[in-house]
């Protein structure tokens, strides 16, 4: 739910201001060059203007700021720090602005920032302290409630020599600053795994989107503490089966709805518990659409229509009987 601005009367800054550099402090409510502003809607849009840095002269009234489709490259510490501060800025959208580095404290001095969208930026370097602003073991709580990080994985040749999952999780967990986060979107990031401690430290989550990644297993992930979780999107991953521990944890969450479409389910003897659970649970949305991908003889069979006799495993032959 990105910030919207239904109110009209956007004013654009005059073209001749575009290259002007003022030594004077900006007028409090002027509109930055190359942007459109609506004081009535408390909205500033600097969209598809190839900006290379965040405008310094943002109006103090701004509540919704769109800086999408630019060429920002780096977001330095205090990128939005102003005097007086942008005290009302609640929604900040930086998607598709070619950011490859977000430094520690990039979002400091934004006391009302509830919603941040960094999607579609190739973030090769996301500081662990990008959201917490400090390297203290326990930071001041971030005001963020919604954090949208879809498709922030950089091309493989631009990644640092470290786990991309680890880099993102470090930023999410630093200083326990994001304990109030309620929506987290991490879709389309080629995640192979989910570090086991990440969800335990985000207890307020209501919506978690991990769709279109490459998750193979949830065996070491615990959902137990996520009492308030309402939607868990796991569509379009590489999940083969959900094991008993995961099934029990999901079933124990009072409000959860899980989305599991388009995973390559392996319908062998290890799938028996999941099939039994699927037949009984109301947790999974669209469960009648889940189909087997493997083994070949089971391809496209509907999971809900399987019985235990269908779910067999090829016996493992003792070594003396195995052929090379």
């Amino acid at each position: 739910s990105s910030p919207t601005s239904s109110a009209s009367s956007f004013s654009s800054s005059a073209p001749f201001l575009a290259s002007a550099v003022s030594a004077q402090p900006p007028l409090p409510d002027q509109c930055p060059a190359l942007c459109e502003c609506s004081e009535a809607a408390r909205t500033v849009k600097c969209v598809n203007r190839n900006l290379t840095e965040v405008p310094t002269d943002l109006p103090a009234y701004v509540r919704n700021l769109f800086l999408t489709g630019n060429q920002l490259a780096v977001l330095p510490a205090g990128a939005f720090a102003r005097r007086p501060p942008l005290a009302e800025l609640a929604a900040l959208n930086l998607s598709g602005s070619r950011l490859d580095e977000v430094r520690a404290g990039a979002f400091e001095h934004l006391p009302s920032l509830r919603q941040l969208d960094l999607s579609h930026n190739p973030l090769a370097d996301l500081s662990p302290f990008a959201f917490s602003g400090s390297n203290a073991s326990v930071s001041a709580p971030s005001p963020l409630v919604e954090l949208i990080l879809n498709h922030i994985v950089p091309p493989e040749d631009e990644r640092q020599n470290r786990s991309f999952e680890g880099m993102v999780v470090a930023a999410l967990l630093a200083g326990r600053a994001l304990q109030g986060l309620r929506r987290l979107e991490l879709a389309s990031n080629h995640f192979l795994y989910l570090p086991r401690d990440v969800l335990a430290q985000l207890p307020s989550l209501r919506h978690l989107d991990l769709s279109n990644n490459s998750l193979v297993s949830l065996t070491y992930v615990s959902f137990r503490n996520l009492t308030h979780l309402e939607s868990l999107h796991l569509e379009d991953n590489a999940l083969k089966v959900l094991h008993n521990g995961t099934l029990a944890e999901l079933q124990g969450l009072p409000h959860i709805r899980v989305f599991l479409d388009n995973n390559p389910w392996v319908c062998d003897c290890h799938m028996a518990d999941m099939v039994t659970w699927l037949k009984e649970t109301e947790v999974v949305q669209g469960k009648d659409r889940l189909t087997c991908a493997y083994p070949e003889k089971m391809r496209n069979r509907v999971l809900l229509e399987l019985n235990s006799a269908d779910l067999d495993c090829d016996p493992i032959l003792p070594p003396s009987l195995q052929t090379s």
């Epitope: 739910s1 009302s112 509830r114 409630v145 919604e146 109030g180 309620r182 929506r183 307020s204 209501r206 919506h207 308030h228 309402e230 939607s231 009072p254 409000h255 959860i256 709805r257 109301e282 947790v283 949305q285």
Partner: antibody, heavy 118, light 113 residues
Framework: EVKVEESGGGLVQPGGSLRLSCAAS????????MSWVRQACGKGLEWVSI???????YYASWAKGRFTISKDNSEGMVYLQMNSLRAEDTAVYYC????????????WGQGTTVTVSS | EIVLTQSPSSLSASVGDRVTITCQSS????????LSWYQQKPGKAPKLLIY???TLASGVPSRFSGSGSGTDFTLTISSLQPEDFATYYC?????????????FGQGTKLEIK
């Protein structure tokens, strides 16, 4: 258009029952919590009950046992079954949608009037 | 039983005045921030003004502001306009092991002086 609309109010005798309905349109009920709030004439707002997206229900202490909230996601309907009605249940009953992120009532119907009288 | 107490219960003010309404909860609201303010005019449904203690709802004029945390909250109207004369309610959301609970304050009627 996103809206909620109540119906089913009317005159009922003490001890009687009534079922209120709330038609939700423009959004999916399975994704939102829905609530009933009431207001007696000249009085303040009073929370009655709430139902979560997946159907868990919660009630004000005074409503437990007499009132039941339910919904039909496919039909886009929320219901409030009221039993053992008393004169003090006379009020305008509002249906309200809860934000998907915050626990606040961000969309209200215009209300339906329930009168309990002999 | 959770109680939300608003003060004053009623007040008279003039156009252009700065008005403050307080709301005190007998228990901390969920996450210390889950308090909302609504405006209601006679014969109409309530309208959301402020949520999460201080966030203005869409389309609400910036003369309205909210503050506070935990159990004590304030609604401020910086410069009263004729259309602001109405009744204002605070609403808290609460969570415990037994589930969710919501409560409203008794209301503050803002009248023209």
């Amino acid at each position: 258009e996103v809206k909620v609309e109540e119906s089913g109010g009317g005159l009922v005798q003490p001890g009687g029952s009534l079922r209120l309905s709330c038609a939700a349109s423009g959004f999916s009920l399975s994704s939102y919590w829905m609530s009933w709030v009431r207001q007696a004439c000249g009085k303040g707002l009073e929370w009655v009950s709430i139902i979560a997206g997946r159907g868990s229900t919660y009630y004000a202490s005074w409503a437990k046992g007499r009132f039941t909230i339910s919904k039909d996601n496919s039909e886009g309907m929320v219901y409030l079954q009221m039993n053992s009605l008393r004169a003090e249940d006379t009020a305008v009953y509002y249906c309200a949608r809860v934000s998907s992120i915050y626990y606040t009532f961000n969309l209200w119907g215009q209300g339906t009037t329930v009168t309990v009288s002999s | 039983e959770i109680v939300l107490t608003q003060s004053p219960s009623s007040l008279s003010a003039s156009v252009g005045d700065r008005v403050t309404i307080t709301c005190q909860s007998s228990q901390s609201v969920y996450s210390n921030n889950e308090l909302s303010w609504y405006q209601q005019k006679p014969g109409k449904a309530p309208k959301l003004l402020i949520y999460y203690a201080s966030t203005l709802a869409s389309g609400v004029p910036s003369r309205f502001s909210g503050s506070g945390s935990g159990t004590d909250f304030t609604l401020t109207i910086s410069s009263l306009q004729p259309e602001d004369f109405a009744t204002y309610y605070c609403q808290g959301s609460y969570y415990s092991g037994s589930g969710w609970y919501y409560a409203f304050g008794q209301g503050t009627k803002l009248e023209i002086k």
